[in-house]
Interface confidence: medium
């Protein structure tokens, strides 16, 4: 019996087609992805093959103005329209709190939403009961397939799930649910989840009875043969893991942003054992037409977005200096504003020892593309912020050793004075440079804001200590020459859309007046 698994993950609000790098579509003839194009391909496969499941491994939420405006209603609507069969909860599904998940998505989705390792407690338990499930048995042709869900146990550090959801260890939580499916005579089981490729592989190895793992969170691109676009494969598709009980378990992921549709064909024997698996992600490029009815629906929903982008988010009473003449040479108040917003967006998980789990921000000055003039009645709009941060990136959470941070700050000024983009703006950091010294030895003082303290204060950076830092995904991926971050980071979790982070902060503050205050000397 043959099953076709179509899968997406980390779509992050890319409802419309995008450019090849998943930013805003400029030249339509070269654009990719989007739900209208995805629907065309899905329908084509559904018509051609008998047993097809369309699955999503989480993080539909967060990433473009679509999510900012519609807050998840767009996810439910278009996933319903595409007739998804199941979805696993990702960490970003909690970005607007539990209510922001329950109302727009859990209550409106026509497909099961899954996570076996999230347990509700207290008053939330009855409110959320039945709205998401640990597993679901889906009829496919004449057979049934069990889908068990899982979500990153780091979600409390990455999003806003509140205090009434407990995120258990994935493997510990999955095993009893898989065992339960076995007792129901379900012998074909897919683990669908959002914990990253390393955890996906562990699940394949450790959870007895899981036949296939469909993952997300790490934006992993797997491919067999010559890759069709810019993404470099992290391994073959499917990636085969030998389980502890000797089975060959295929593990798949489909990069991110709806650029690819994962396509995996699995052959099962009559006892539910995987006989063979093969496939590849399908690049959703312009050779695949956009479905006209979905496209018309997208255009209809789009109208509200255009209007939103010109509405006032808040006011500034000072000039927001985002000029390259400032931000690539010295501390600029636009950089301070953005870093303050980045930290504010990550205020979570305080306890009696830590005032917050992260206190530091770094931001490449070259990523700040425009100032905002306060003389326009002080008004700040989404449109203004899109000019400042036009690349559609995210502000991510990484863990780095102090020694890596020191290298990053040396790189920041290694060719100072040439108006290059690597000059770092900061938050929760005081750095002193001596530019008379030779490149690679210019950082003379580097103090960082403590987290394990009741009164935050600046302490000297410790080379062997592990620090959490918020930074643009561009830097986490080694952009602007920050190869040491990419090579040496100990953990990387994707965060919220850059403009959304700043716009939320400005809306919260209502009136802003960031200063140049001696963070960089």
């Amino acid at each position: 019996w043959e099953l076709t698994i179509l899968h997406t993950n980390d779509v992050h609000s890319r409802l419309e087609q995008t450019s090849e790098d998943s930013s805003k579509c400029v030249n339509a003839s070269r654009c990719m992805g989007g739900v209208a194009r995805l629907f065309t391909k899905v329908q084509q496969i559904r018509r051609a093959e008998p047993n097809v499941l369309l699955l999503d491994a989480g993080d539909q939420y967060q990433g473009t103005i679509w999510f900012t405006v519609y807050k998840g209603a767009e996810v439910a609507h278009f996933m319903n329209a595409l007739r998804y069969d199941a979805m696993a909860l990702g960490n970003h599904e909690f970005d607007n709190g539990v209510e922001g998940l329950i109302e727009p998505l859990l209550k409106e989705a026509k497909f099961p939403i899954l996570s076996a390792n999230i347990k509700a407690k207290g008053p939330l338990a009855s409110q959320i009961s039945g709205l998401y499930l640990p597993y679901k048995v889906l009829p496919v042709g004449d057979e049934v397939v069990g889908i068990v869900g899982y979500t990153s146990k780091e979600t409390p550090f990455l999003s806003n799930p509140g205090t009434n959801l407990v995120f258990e260890d994935e493997i510990t939580a999955l095993q009893p649910e898989v065992d339960k499916l076995k007792t129901l005579n379900v012998n074909k089981i897919i683990a669908l989840g959002h914990s990253g490729f390393e955890t996906d592989k562990l699940i394949a190895q450790k959870v007895r009875g899981v036949d296939v793992v469909v993952g997300g969170h790490s934006n992993t691109f797997l491919y067999t043969g010559n890759p069709p676009s810019k993404e470099v494969p992290a391994g073959k598709y499917p990636f085969i893991v030998t389980s502890d009980d000797g089975r060959k378990v295929p593990v798949v992921q489909a990069y991110a942003f709806g650029k690819y549709l994962g396509y995996l064909k699995i052959e099962f024997d009559e006892r539910g054992n995987v006989i063979s698996s093969h496939g590849n992600p399908i690049l959703l490029n312009s050779s695949i037409p956009e479905d006209p009815s979905i496209k018309a629906d997208i255009n209809k929903w789009r109208i509200k977005l255009d209007n939103y982008s010109t509405q006032e988010l808040g006011k500034t009473i000072v000039y927001l200096d985002g000029s390259s003449q400032s931000c690539r040479f010295r501390e600029c108040n636009m950089g301070n504003l953005i870093c303050d917003a980045m930290i504010n967006n990550n205020l979570r998980h305080a306890d009696e020892m830590f005032w917050n789990h992260v206190s530091m921000c770094i931001l490449n000055g070259g990523g700040i593309r425009s100032p905002i003039d306060e003389r326009n009645n002080g008004t700040i709009t989404w449109e203004n912020l899109a000019a400042v941060l036009p690349f559609g990136g995210t502000f991510d959470l990484v863990q780095l050793k102090g020694s890596t941070l020191k290298k990053a700050f040396e790189h920041s000024v290694h060719r100072y004075g040439q108006s290059t983009g690597e000059f770092l703006q900061v938050g929760g950091i005081h750095v002193v440079y001596d530019l008379s010294r030779k490149p690679g030895d210019r950082v003379v003082k580097l103090d960082v804001l403590c987290t394990k303290c009741r009164v935050p204060s600046y302490d000297p950076l410790k080379m062997d200590e592990i620090y959490k830092v918020i930074l643009p995904n561009f830097l986490a991926n080694g952009g602007d020459g920050f190869q040491m971050i990419k090579d040496e980071l100990l953990r990387h979790d994707s965060g919220d859309q850059d403009i959304n982070v700043v716009s939320t902060y400005i809306s919260k503050m209502k009136v802003i007046y960031p200063a140049v205050e001696g963070r960089i000397k």
Epitope: Y70, A73, H77, P104, A109, K110, I303, K304, N307
Partner: antibody, heavy 124, light 106 residues
Framework: EVQLLESGGGLVQPGGSLRLSCAAS????????MSWVRQAPGKGLEWVSA????????YYADSVKGRFTISRDNSKNTLYLQMNSLRAEDTAVYYC?????????????????WGQGTLVTVSS | EIVMTQSPATLSVSPGERATLSCRAS??????LAWYQQKPGQAPRLLIY???TRATGIPARFSGSGSGTEFTLTISSLQSEDFAVYYC????????FGGGTKVEIK
């Protein structure tokens, strides 16, 4: 082809009840929000009630709140309006229309398809 | 409640002429405004949504404009089949319709 067909209208005395139905075809009914709109003889249009695709959210005009109940049976592709405590001013043609709230009302859609309407007359 | 006011109540126009219908909202509805056409004995038909986007199958002679509180429906050259009642509708917060404008033959 999208079709909406209302039924259940008629003459009813003040204080009485009536249940309207709207049979939908030609689209995935459960994906879409639905509404009721009425039009008194010789008058303009008045929105009455709306329901989300999975019936998790319902909305009513103030003039009918507490008296009318909107519901849907997605397995039968049918929308309903239960009207109780009817008054003379409820006399109208009642239209079923495709469109309404999504995501608990964060997005309201326009009415792109309408039924032909069913006449409700409240008179003694 | 958002109140929608249409003017004029009746508009007398000769075939081939231009007709301009107005709709005013009591508070801003952004671009969440639709126009419907209704002929005697028929259900309304969606013409324009998003203040200016023509619905599927609607001829180009119908155009909408405006945002916030002031909106206009223009029929560039009236055809015989265009004589009808036109309603505006806001859909920012639930729904409210205007009282209608009857376009009649002059």
């Amino acid at each position: 082809e999208v079709q909406l067909l209302e039924s259940g209208g008629g003459l009813v005395q003040p204080g009485g009840s009536l249940r309207l139905s709207c049979a939908a075809s030609g689209f995935t009914f459960s994906n879409l929000a639905m509404s009721w709109v009425r039009q008194a003889p010789g008058k303009g249009l008045e929105w009455v009630s709306a329901i989300s695709g999975r019936a998790t959210s319902t909305y009513y005009a103030d003039s009918v709140k507490g008296r009318f109940t909107i519901s849907r049976d997605n397995s039968k592709n049918t929308l309903y309006l239960q009207m109780n405590s009817l008054r003379a001013e409820d006399t109208a043609v009642y239209y079923c229309a495709r469109g309404g709230p999504y995501g608990s009302g964060s997005y309201w859609d326009t009415f792109d398809y309408w039924g032909q309407g069913t006449l409700v007359t409240v008179s003694s | 409640e958002i109140v929608m006011t249409q003017s004029p109540a009746t508009l007398s126009v000769s075939p081939g002429e231009r007709a301009t219908l107005s709709c005013r909202a009591s508070q801003s509805v952004s671009s969440n405004l639709a126009w419907y056409q209704q002929k005697p004995g028929q259900a309304p038909r969606l013409l324009i949504y998003g203040a200016s986007t023509r619905a599927t199958g609607i001829p180009a002679r119908f155009s909408g404009s405006g945002s916030g509180t002031e909106f206009t429906l223009t029929i560039s050259s009236l055809q015989s089949e265009d004589f009808a009642v036109y309603y505006c509708q806001q859909y920012t917060n639930h729904y409210t319709f205007g009282g209608g404008t009857k376009v009649e033959i002059k």
